[in-house]
Protein backbone atom coordinates (compact mmCIF):
# COMPACT_ATOMS: atom_id res chain seq x y z
CA UNK A 1 0.00 0.00 0.00
CA UNK A 2 1.40 3.20 -1.20
CA UNK A 3 0.45 6.95 -1.04
CA UNK A 4 2.32 9.53 -3.05
CA UNK A 5 3.72 12.92 -1.71
CA UNK A 6 4.30 15.87 -3.61
CA UNK A 7 5.66 19.51 -2.65
CA UNK A 8 8.30 20.81 0.00
CA UNK A 9 6.75 18.62 2.81
CA UNK A 10 8.37 15.38 1.68
CA UNK A 11 11.29 15.75 3.12
CA UNK A 12 9.81 15.60 6.64
CA UNK A 13 7.46 13.16 5.43
CA UNK A 14 10.26 10.75 4.95
CA UNK A 15 11.86 10.38 8.53
CA UNK A 16 8.34 10.45 9.61
CA UNK A 17 6.93 6.62 7.64
CA UNK A 18 5.78 4.83 10.49
CA UNK A 19 5.48 1.48 11.37
CA UNK A 20 7.95 0.04 9.66
CA UNK A 21 7.58 2.00 6.49
CA UNK A 22 10.53 3.15 4.14
CA UNK A 23 10.68 6.12 1.94
CA UNK A 24 11.42 5.48 -1.58
CA UNK A 25 11.67 8.92 -2.31
CA UNK A 26 8.13 9.78 -3.15
CA UNK A 27 6.00 8.11 -0.49
CA UNK A 28 6.49 5.67 2.36
CA UNK A 29 6.18 2.13 1.52
CA UNK A 30 3.94 0.58 3.79
CA UNK A 31 4.22 -2.82 5.45
CA UNK A 32 1.31 -5.18 4.85
CA UNK A 33 -1.22 -4.59 7.59
CA UNK A 34 -0.39 -0.32 7.52
CA UNK A 35 -1.61 2.48 4.82
CA UNK A 36 -1.55 6.35 4.82
CA UNK A 37 0.34 8.98 3.80
CA UNK A 38 2.84 8.12 7.19
CA UNK A 39 1.45 4.41 7.18
CA UNK A 40 0.04 5.69 10.22
CA UNK A 41 -3.41 3.71 9.10
CA UNK A 42 -4.02 -0.18 10.16
CA UNK A 43 -5.94 -2.03 7.07
CA UNK A 44 -9.32 -3.27 8.22
CA UNK A 45 -8.89 -6.86 6.49
CA UNK A 46 -6.07 -8.78 5.37
CA UNK A 47 -6.02 -11.27 2.38
CA UNK A 48 -5.85 -15.02 3.76
CA UNK A 49 -6.90 -16.18 0.21
CA UNK A 50 -6.71 -19.87 0.60
CA UNK A 51 -5.47 -22.04 -1.59
CA UNK A 52 -7.29 -23.44 -4.30
CA UNK A 53 -6.72 -27.01 -3.22
CA UNK A 54 -5.57 -28.81 -0.08
CA UNK A 55 -3.46 -32.15 -0.52
CA UNK A 56 -3.73 -35.31 1.35
CA UNK A 57 -0.53 -38.04 1.54
CA UNK A 58 -1.38 -41.41 2.54
CA UNK A 59 1.76 -43.67 3.02
CA UNK A 60 0.93 -47.06 2.68
CA UNK A 61 2.74 -50.41 1.86
CA UNK A 62 1.11 -53.43 -0.32
CA UNK A 63 2.64 -56.66 -0.63
CA UNK A 64 2.62 -57.48 -4.68
CA UNK A 65 2.91 -61.43 -5.01
CA UNK A 66 2.21 -61.83 -8.71
CA UNK A 67 6.05 -60.22 -8.85
CA UNK A 68 9.27 -61.61 -8.27
CA UNK A 69 11.34 -59.46 -6.44
CA UNK A 70 14.58 -59.00 -8.38
CA UNK A 71 17.60 -56.18 -6.97
CA UNK A 72 16.84 -54.31 -10.84
CA UNK A 73 13.93 -53.19 -9.16
CA UNK A 74 16.04 -50.78 -6.39
CA UNK A 75 16.97 -49.22 -9.45
CA UNK A 76 14.18 -46.16 -10.08
CA UNK A 77 15.88 -45.85 -13.45
CA UNK A 78 15.90 -49.79 -14.87
CA UNK A 79 13.37 -51.06 -17.13
CA UNK A 80 12.16 -53.40 -14.61
CA UNK A 81 11.05 -50.85 -11.96
CA UNK A 82 9.99 -48.41 -14.85
CA UNK A 83 7.58 -51.49 -16.53
CA UNK A 84 6.19 -52.33 -12.31
CA UNK A 85 5.41 -48.64 -11.80
CA UNK A 86 3.83 -48.34 -15.14
CA UNK A 87 1.39 -51.69 -14.13
CA UNK A 88 1.12 -50.63 -10.32
CA UNK A 89 -0.13 -47.21 -11.53
CA UNK A 90 -2.64 -48.68 -13.58
CA UNK A 91 -3.64 -50.95 -11.37
CA UNK A 92 -4.44 -48.67 -8.39
CA UNK A 93 -5.80 -46.04 -10.98
CA UNK A 94 -8.48 -48.81 -10.96
CA UNK A 95 -8.77 -49.41 -7.49
CA UNK A 96 -9.42 -46.01 -6.51
CA UNK A 97 -10.98 -44.82 -9.75
CA UNK A 98 -14.37 -43.90 -7.67
CA UNK A 99 -12.76 -41.62 -5.55
CA UNK A 100 -12.72 -37.97 -6.84
CA UNK A 101 -10.08 -36.70 -4.56
CA UNK A 102 -8.06 -39.62 -5.97
CA UNK A 103 -4.99 -37.39 -7.76
CA UNK A 104 -2.47 -41.16 -8.44
CA UNK A 105 0.08 -42.77 -7.03
CA UNK A 106 3.76 -42.75 -6.06
CA UNK A 107 6.39 -45.66 -5.44
CA UNK A 108 8.76 -44.43 -2.56
CA UNK A 109 10.41 -47.63 -2.20
CA UNK A 110 10.71 -51.53 -3.68
CA UNK A 111 11.64 -54.23 -1.33
CA UNK A 112 12.12 -58.04 -0.90
CA UNK A 113 9.51 -60.01 0.06
CA UNK A 114 7.41 -60.97 -3.21
CA UNK A 115 7.72 -57.56 -3.79
CA UNK A 116 6.81 -54.93 -0.96
CA UNK A 117 5.59 -51.52 -2.44
CA UNK A 118 5.97 -48.48 -0.01
CA UNK A 119 4.00 -46.23 -2.16
CA UNK A 120 1.77 -42.57 -1.55
CA UNK A 121 -1.87 -42.16 -2.14
CA UNK A 122 -2.04 -38.71 -3.42
CA UNK A 123 -5.81 -36.92 -3.01
CA UNK A 124 -6.62 -33.65 -3.51
CA UNK A 125 -9.91 -31.49 -3.07
CA UNK A 126 -11.07 -28.20 -3.84
CA UNK A 127 -10.85 -25.90 -0.64
CA UNK A 128 -13.97 -25.78 1.09
CA UNK A 129 -14.30 -25.24 4.94
CA UNK A 130 -15.05 -28.51 5.12
CA UNK A 131 -12.43 -29.84 3.36
CA UNK A 132 -11.11 -31.90 5.87
CA UNK A 133 -14.23 -34.15 6.60
CA UNK A 134 -13.78 -34.46 2.76
CA UNK A 135 -10.40 -35.92 2.86
CA UNK A 136 -10.85 -37.83 6.11
CA UNK A 137 -13.76 -39.44 4.04
CA UNK A 138 -11.77 -39.91 0.70
CA UNK A 139 -8.87 -41.67 3.05
CA UNK A 140 -11.20 -44.27 4.55
CA UNK A 141 -12.76 -45.06 1.03
CA UNK A 142 -8.82 -45.40 -0.12
CA UNK A 143 -8.32 -47.84 3.51
CA UNK A 144 -11.75 -50.02 2.46
CA UNK A 145 -10.75 -50.12 -0.94
CA UNK A 146 -7.41 -51.31 -0.62
CA UNK A 147 -8.41 -53.83 1.41
CA UNK A 148 -11.08 -55.11 -0.58
CA UNK A 149 -8.43 -55.31 -3.52
CA UNK A 150 -5.68 -57.34 -2.12
CA UNK A 151 -8.04 -59.51 -0.32
CA UNK A 152 -9.63 -60.48 -3.84
CA UNK A 153 -7.03 -60.27 -6.15
CA UNK A 154 -4.12 -62.90 -4.44
CA UNK A 155 -2.69 -65.79 -5.84
CA UNK A 156 -4.84 -69.65 -7.14
CA UNK A 157 -2.23 -72.36 -7.53
CA UNK A 158 0.55 -70.02 -8.38
CA UNK A 159 -0.31 -68.04 -10.98
CA UNK A 160 -2.43 -64.98 -10.57
CA UNK A 161 -4.94 -64.35 -12.97
CA UNK A 162 -5.59 -60.21 -12.57
CA UNK A 163 -3.40 -57.73 -13.20
CA UNK A 164 -1.63 -57.47 -10.12
CA UNK A 165 -2.30 -59.94 -6.99
CA UNK A 166 -1.41 -59.69 -3.27
CA UNK A 167 -0.79 -60.75 0.31
CA UNK A 168 -3.55 -59.98 1.74
CA UNK A 169 -1.67 -59.44 5.23
CA UNK A 170 0.69 -56.89 3.99
CA UNK A 171 -1.39 -54.25 3.56
CA UNK A 172 -0.69 -51.42 6.20
CA UNK A 173 -1.26 -47.89 6.41
CA UNK A 174 1.60 -45.85 7.62
CA UNK A 175 0.90 -42.41 8.26
CA UNK A 176 -1.72 -39.48 6.90
CA UNK A 177 -0.92 -36.04 6.27
CA UNK A 178 -3.49 -33.81 5.18
CA UNK A 179 -1.97 -30.03 4.04
CA UNK A 180 -3.02 -27.77 6.63
CA UNK A 181 -4.90 -24.71 6.15
CA UNK A 182 -6.13 -22.79 9.29
CA UNK A 183 -7.48 -19.50 8.15
CA UNK A 184 -7.62 -18.42 11.45
CA UNK A 185 -4.17 -18.91 12.48
CA UNK A 186 -2.93 -17.21 9.61
CA UNK A 187 -5.30 -14.53 9.90
CA UNK A 188 -3.91 -13.85 13.98
CA UNK A 189 -0.88 -14.29 12.80
CA UNK A 190 -0.89 -12.03 10.21
CA UNK A 191 -2.86 -8.82 12.14
CA UNK A 192 0.34 -9.70 14.47
CA UNK A 193 -0.24 -7.33 17.71
CA UNK A 194 -4.40 -6.54 16.34
CA UNK A 195 -4.51 -10.31 16.50
CA UNK A 196 -7.01 -10.21 19.30
CA UNK A 197 -9.10 -7.98 17.06
CA UNK A 198 -9.47 -9.24 13.45
CA UNK A 199 -11.83 -12.47 12.58
CA UNK A 200 -12.46 -14.57 10.04
CA UNK A 201 -15.82 -14.15 8.27
CA UNK A 202 -17.27 -16.56 5.08
CA UNK A 203 -18.57 -15.42 2.03
CA UNK A 204 -19.59 -17.78 -0.58
CA UNK A 205 -17.19 -19.93 0.73
CA UNK A 206 -14.30 -18.05 0.95
CA UNK A 207 -12.33 -16.98 3.96
CA UNK A 208 -11.97 -13.09 4.97
CA UNK A 209 -9.55 -11.84 7.65
CA UNK A 210 -11.35 -8.70 8.89
CA UNK A 211 -11.49 -6.31 11.86
CA UNK A 212 -14.79 -4.43 13.10
CA UNK A 213 -13.60 -2.00 10.95
CA UNK A 214 -14.20 -3.38 7.90
CA UNK A 215 -18.01 -2.58 6.56
CA UNK A 216 -20.66 -5.06 5.28
CA UNK A 217 -19.61 -7.79 7.89
CA UNK A 218 -21.66 -9.33 10.78
CA UNK A 219 -18.87 -8.21 13.20
CA UNK A 220 -18.54 -4.79 11.40
CA UNK A 221 -18.72 -1.47 14.06
CA UNK A 222 -20.91 1.40 12.69
CA UNK A 223 -19.47 4.02 13.30
CA UNK A 224 -22.21 5.94 12.26
CA UNK A 225 -20.70 9.46 10.30
CA UNK A 226 -18.08 8.85 12.03
CA UNK A 227 -14.60 6.69 11.02
CA UNK A 228 -13.37 3.93 12.60
CA UNK A 229 -10.04 3.09 13.39
CA UNK A 230 -7.65 0.48 14.92
CA UNK A 231 -5.83 1.00 17.55
CA UNK A 232 -3.58 -1.39 20.12
CA UNK A 233 -6.60 -1.37 22.38
CA UNK A 234 -9.20 -2.39 19.93
CA UNK A 235 -11.22 -0.66 16.86
CA UNK A 236 -12.83 3.04 17.92
CA UNK A 237 -14.87 5.04 16.47
CA UNK A 238 -13.50 8.55 15.39
CA UNK A 239 -16.49 11.10 15.76
CA UNK A 240 -16.95 14.15 12.77
CA UNK A 241 -17.94 17.59 13.57
CA UNK A 242 -19.75 18.84 10.61
CA UNK A 243 -21.07 22.07 10.10
CA UNK A 244 -24.40 21.82 12.45
CA UNK A 245 -23.26 18.93 14.68
CA UNK A 246 -20.87 17.57 17.34
CA UNK A 247 -20.64 13.87 17.27
CA UNK A 248 -20.07 11.46 20.12
CA UNK A 249 -20.35 8.57 21.57
CA UNK A 250 -18.90 5.48 21.27
CA UNK A 251 -20.33 4.57 17.68
CA UNK A 252 -20.83 8.53 16.72
CA UNK A 253 -24.57 8.63 17.49
CA UNK A 254 -24.62 10.85 19.68
CA UNK A 255 -25.37 14.35 17.50
CA UNK A 256 -25.36 17.72 19.50
CA UNK A 257 -26.69 20.68 17.66
CA UNK A 258 -23.74 23.29 17.31
CA UNK A 259 -26.43 26.36 17.52
CA UNK A 260 -28.15 24.50 21.01
CA UNK A 261 -24.26 24.51 22.40
CA UNK A 262 -23.77 27.86 21.43
CA UNK A 263 -26.78 29.37 22.63
CA UNK A 264 -26.45 28.03 26.09
CA UNK A 265 -23.19 29.49 26.20
CA UNK A 266 -24.44 32.79 24.64
CA UNK A 267 -27.58 32.67 27.87
CA UNK A 268 -24.34 31.86 30.35
CA UNK A 269 -22.35 34.79 29.56
CA UNK B 1 13.03 -51.86 -28.73
CA UNK B 2 11.48 -54.86 -27.50
CA UNK B 3 10.21 -56.56 -31.27
CA UNK B 4 8.30 -59.97 -30.78
CA UNK B 5 7.50 -62.07 -34.23
CA UNK B 6 5.32 -64.71 -34.00
CA UNK B 7 5.50 -68.06 -36.48
CA UNK B 8 4.27 -71.60 -36.84
CA UNK B 9 0.59 -71.16 -36.94
CA UNK B 10 -1.71 -72.93 -39.33
CA UNK B 11 -4.60 -75.96 -39.90
CA UNK B 12 -4.69 -78.84 -37.78
CA UNK B 13 -6.85 -81.38 -37.32
CA UNK B 14 -8.09 -82.65 -33.88
CA UNK B 15 -6.02 -84.32 -31.89
CA UNK B 16 -2.39 -83.24 -33.88
CA UNK B 17 0.07 -80.99 -32.89
CA UNK B 18 1.64 -77.54 -33.89
CA UNK B 19 5.05 -75.69 -32.22
CA UNK B 20 4.58 -71.98 -32.51
CA UNK B 21 7.82 -69.89 -31.95
CA UNK B 22 8.76 -66.55 -31.27
CA UNK B 23 11.53 -64.65 -32.22
CA UNK B 24 12.55 -61.62 -29.62
CA UNK B 25 14.83 -58.81 -30.42
CA UNK B 26 15.55 -55.85 -27.80
CA UNK B 27 14.72 -58.06 -24.72
CA UNK B 28 17.24 -60.51 -23.21
CA UNK B 29 15.45 -64.08 -21.95
CA UNK B 30 18.23 -64.23 -18.91
CA UNK B 31 15.69 -61.40 -17.04
CA UNK B 32 12.09 -61.55 -17.15
CA UNK B 33 9.37 -63.62 -18.19
CA UNK B 34 7.51 -64.21 -21.11
CA UNK B 35 4.01 -65.94 -22.06
CA UNK B 36 1.79 -67.12 -24.71
CA UNK B 37 -1.67 -65.59 -25.01
CA UNK B 38 -4.34 -66.77 -27.22
CA UNK B 39 -7.81 -64.82 -28.15
CA UNK B 40 -10.33 -66.26 -30.26
CA UNK B 41 -13.10 -64.67 -32.17
CA UNK B 42 -15.62 -62.78 -30.38
CA UNK B 43 -13.56 -63.96 -27.10
CA UNK B 44 -11.45 -61.69 -24.97
CA UNK B 45 -7.46 -62.36 -24.65
CA UNK B 46 -6.49 -65.17 -22.20
CA UNK B 47 -3.78 -66.82 -20.76
CA UNK B 48 -1.85 -69.99 -22.09
CA UNK B 49 1.70 -69.95 -20.15
CA UNK B 50 3.95 -68.29 -18.73
CA UNK B 51 8.20 -69.42 -18.54
CA UNK B 52 10.07 -66.97 -16.31
CA UNK B 53 13.78 -66.36 -16.03
CA UNK B 54 14.23 -68.29 -12.43
CA UNK B 55 12.95 -71.41 -14.59
CA UNK B 56 9.47 -71.43 -13.30
CA UNK B 57 6.66 -72.23 -15.48
CA UNK B 58 3.03 -71.97 -15.51
CA UNK B 59 0.08 -73.04 -17.52
CA UNK B 60 -3.54 -72.15 -17.58
CA UNK B 61 -6.31 -75.17 -16.46
CA UNK B 62 -7.20 -75.58 -19.78
CA UNK B 63 -4.03 -76.51 -21.43
CA UNK B 64 -2.29 -78.53 -18.51
CA UNK B 65 -0.54 -81.82 -19.54
CA UNK B 66 -1.55 -80.89 -23.40
CA UNK B 67 0.89 -77.77 -24.04
CA UNK B 68 4.60 -76.96 -23.18
CA UNK B 69 6.37 -73.82 -22.90
CA UNK B 70 10.07 -73.41 -23.29
CA UNK B 71 12.68 -70.97 -24.43
CA UNK B 72 16.39 -71.06 -26.03
CA UNK B 73 18.50 -68.40 -24.49
CA UNK B 74 20.87 -68.30 -27.27
CA UNK B 75 18.31 -67.86 -29.89
CA UNK B 76 16.40 -65.42 -28.58
CA UNK B 77 13.17 -67.49 -28.86
CA UNK B 78 9.82 -69.00 -26.92
CA UNK B 79 8.48 -71.68 -27.57
CA UNK B 80 4.73 -73.31 -27.42
CA UNK B 81 4.09 -77.22 -28.20
CA UNK B 82 0.60 -77.88 -28.52
CA UNK B 83 -0.38 -81.73 -28.51
CA UNK B 84 -3.61 -82.83 -28.14
CA UNK B 85 -5.23 -79.80 -30.43
CA UNK B 86 -9.21 -79.70 -29.80
CA UNK B 87 -11.26 -77.62 -32.16
CA UNK B 88 -11.75 -74.99 -28.49
CA UNK B 89 -7.84 -74.22 -28.91
CA UNK B 90 -8.77 -72.20 -32.33
CA UNK B 91 -7.55 -68.57 -31.78
CA UNK B 92 -4.47 -65.74 -32.76
CA UNK B 93 -1.56 -66.91 -30.26
CA UNK B 94 0.24 -63.96 -29.28
CA UNK B 95 3.65 -63.86 -27.92
CA UNK B 96 4.26 -61.80 -24.99
CA UNK B 97 7.13 -60.37 -22.68
CA UNK B 98 8.16 -58.37 -19.28
CA UNK B 99 11.18 -57.45 -17.69
CA UNK B 100 9.40 -58.20 -14.25
CA UNK B 101 9.88 -62.23 -13.54
CA UNK B 102 5.79 -62.59 -13.88
CA UNK B 103 3.56 -65.01 -12.19
CA UNK B 104 0.67 -63.18 -14.16
CA UNK B 105 -1.54 -64.47 -16.86
CA UNK B 106 -3.93 -61.75 -17.31
CA UNK B 107 -2.96 -59.46 -20.80
CA UNK B 108 -3.23 -56.31 -18.66
CA UNK B 109 -0.09 -57.46 -16.47
CA UNK B 110 2.07 -57.42 -20.14
CA UNK B 111 3.62 -54.89 -21.60
CA UNK B 112 5.17 -56.12 -25.39
CA UNK B 113 3.19 -58.19 -27.53
CA UNK B 114 3.60 -59.18 -30.93
CA UNK B 115 1.38 -59.28 -33.89
CA UNK B 116 0.08 -62.83 -33.47
CA UNK B 117 -0.07 -66.47 -35.81
CA UNK B 118 -3.34 -67.93 -36.68
CA UNK B 119 -4.15 -71.36 -35.54
CA UNK B 120 -7.12 -73.32 -37.18
CA UNK B 121 -8.03 -76.81 -35.20
CA UNK B 122 -10.83 -77.95 -37.78
CA UNK B 123 -11.45 -81.32 -39.36
Known amino acids: RTTTCFGDGCQNTASRCKNGGTWDGLKCQCPNLYYGELCEEVVSSIDIGPPETISAQMELTVTVTSVKFTEELKNHSSQEFQEFKQTFTEQMNIVYSGIPEYVGVNITKLRLGSVVVEHDVLLRTKYTPEYKTVLDNATEVVKEKITKVTTQQIMINDICSDMMCFNTTGTQVQNITVTQYDPEEDCRKMAKEYGDYFVVEYRDQKPYCISPCEPGFSVSKNCNLGKCQMSLSGPQCLCVTTETHWYSGETCNQGTQKSLVYGHHHHHH | EVQLVESGGGLVQPGGSLRLSCAAS????????MSWFRQAPGKEREGVAI???????GYADSVKGRFTISQDNAKNSLYLQMNSLRAEDTAVYYC?????????????????WGQGTMVTVSS
Open chain 2, 26 to 33: GFTFSRGS
Open chain 2, 51 to 57: ISSDGWT
Open chain 2, 96 to 112: AASFLVLRALNPKAWHY
